[in-house]
């Protein structure tokens, strides 16, 4: 069954945590649907963003942070492991020094920590996708 | 009650026709939600686009056409009559020489015909909005 989009969930992250997302683009890649995942510092959508991950399917991925309301320097990748019309599984793992993003089991993107992952309080998944799974797993201490 | 998004409807347009859309952005303008309206030449979403209208709320509007699979020259406007968090009413009127786009009753954008409006067979409304009304009115002959 489908989860509502935008999908918002409270989350606490630290090294060893993994956010897993399963979904499907709502349009063909020719029409450039988007997927966005934002790790927020508060439960409010206007709060700062520790890690912003935006896919323009078929074109590019951009990653960034939003601090005190201002976007910082964007990181862009042309790597495009997503398949047109196909379901994807995305997992974002918190490593000691960076986020590692896996797409369908394949390491695809990394983003150095600019802000501590412990500052994350909420994850939002949105834009042009249908969503079937959202999970935050915590490393057993 | 809400219409599904993406929303797709068969349509035939000619001078005098008006497409009316009522909806609301799904996110605050800080997060840059999008609205897109595409007038397609076929019932398929990968078909050419006679008139492409895309709002990045709070930032800009771009208009274009997609012909034989290729995007043409984009027209950009910084005019932003949409209000953060507020419902909007958008009407696109087919004039003899152009499309006229009204936002909340105010003439906001125009786009010269590149392809005959009679070539339109389908209208799609999508991206980061909730949709409460979609209507195509035809001029009585």
């Amino acid at each position: 069954s489908l989860l509502p989009v935008p999908y918002t969930e409270a989350a606490s992250l630290s090294t060893g945590s993994t956010v897993t997302i399963k979904g499907r683009p709502l349009a063909c890649f020719l029409n450039e649907p988007y997927l966005q995942v934002d790790f927020h510092t508060e439960m409010k959508e206007e709060s700062d963003i520790v890690f912003h991950f935006q896919v323009c399917f078929g074109r590019r991925v951009v990653m960034n942070s939003r601090e005190y309301g201002a976007w910082k320097q964007q990181v862009e990748s042309k790597n495009m492991p997503f398949q047109d019309g196909q379901e994807f599984e995305l997992s974002i793992s918190v490593l000691p020094d960076k986020y590692q993003v896996m797409v369908n089991g394949q390491s695809s993107y990394t983003f150095d920590h600019r802000i501590k992952p412990e500052a994350v309080k909420m994850v939002q998944v949105w834009r042009d996708i249908s969503l079937t799974k959202f999970n935050v797993s915590y490393l057993k201490r | 009650s809400l219409l599904p998004v993406p929303y797709t409807e068969a349509a035939s347009l000619s001078t005098g026709s008006t497409v009316t859309i009522k909806g609301r952005p799904l996110a605050c303008f800080l997060n840059e939600p999008y609205l897109q309206v595409d007038f397609h030449t076929e019932m398929k979403e990968e078909s050419d686009i006679v008139f492409h209208f895309q709002v990045c709320f709070g930032r800009r509007v771009v208009m274009n056409s997609r012909e034989y699979g290729a995007w043409k020259q984009q027209v950009e406007s910084k005019n932003m009559p949409f209000q953060d968090g507020q419902e909007f009413e958008l009407s696109i009127s087919v004039l003899p020489d152009k499309y006229q786009v009204m936002v909340n009753g105010q003439s906001s954008y125009t786009f010269d015909h590149r392809i005959k409006p009679e070539a339109v067979k389908m209208v799609q409304v999508w991206r980061d909005i909730s949709l409460t009304k979609f209507n195509v009115s035809y001029l009585k002959r």
């Epitope: 510092t41 942070s65 601090e67 201002a70 910082k72 990181v75 150095d112 802000i115 501590k116 500052a119 | -």
Partner: antibody
């Protein structure tokens, strides 16, 4: 061996200008964000400015904003600091420093290599 | 105005003992701390980054931690060569560095 060598310091009158250079060697200069940090005589460190690896993004301390301009020439492996409208309080040793991680001047990872510094004296 | 990080002006430690230097006033719940060692007439040297990471070549006796608005540099078993000034650094934002006023480690 990684080296950062500053030059261009000297005596200048208040209101005057100076251009500092930092010649980099021993690493892929074009891949790293860089910074200028200064230290007034007998005082602590003060961050002045930084620039991303490509040169398209810059940041400045409030105390120098509008007067100083950071830039880089990746073909020449050189970092610059153009200092205008100099004030007596700008008098300091100016250090050029390399950020530990690539492209972005990420304070989280600090600055792992520093030059020996060049002295700027502002006096009439 | 720049964010202000407050450090004690001096900390005294006996040879082989543990020194702790604090840095207050930073948003260490959000931003990481780095620490630098500076000896007279020399350029600063990075000894800790990302709160607790040591660059290669830095002895294990140097460690770091942070909690709330305070970051701490700990030197376990201080050696004579550790006598120096120590500066904390964090961010007003991730790309906007700010330094503490510095702490002179003495007594060695």
């Amino acid at each position: 061996e990684l080296q950062l060598v500053e030059s261009g310091g000297g005596l200048v009158q208040p209101g005057g200008s100076l251009r500092l250079s930092c010649a980099a060697s021993g690493f892929t200069f074009s891949s790293y964000a860089m910074s200028w940090v200064r230290q007034a005589p007998g005082k602590g460190l003060e961050w002045v400015s930084n620039i991303n690896s490509g040169g398209g993004s810059t940041g400045y301390a409030d105390s120098v904003k509008g007067r100083f301009t950071i830039s880089r020439d990746n073909a020449k492996n050189t970092l610059y600091l153009q200092m205008n409208s100099l004030k007596p309080e700008d008098m300091a040793v100016y250090y050029c420093a390399k950020y530990l991680r690539t492209y972005y001047p990420n304070a989280a990872f600090g600055m792992d290599y520093w030059g020996k510094g060049t002295l700027v004296t502002v006096s009439s | 105005s720049q964010a202000v990080l407050t450090q004690p002006s001096a900390v005294s430690v006996s040879l082989g003992q543990t020194a702790r230097i604090t840095c207050q006033g930073g948003n260490f719940g959000r931003y990481y701390a780095s620490w630098y060692q500076q000896k007279p007439g020399q350029a600063p040297v990075l000894v800790i980054y990302r709160d607790s990471e040591r660059p290669s070549g830095i002895p294990e006796r140097f460690s770091g931690s942070s909690s709330g608005d305070t970051a701490t540099l700990t030197i376990s078993g201080a050696q004579a060569e550790d006598e120096a000034d120590y500066y904390c650094q964090s961010g007003r934002s991730s790309d906007n560095a700010v330094f503490g006023g510095g702490t002179h480690l003495t007594g060695l």
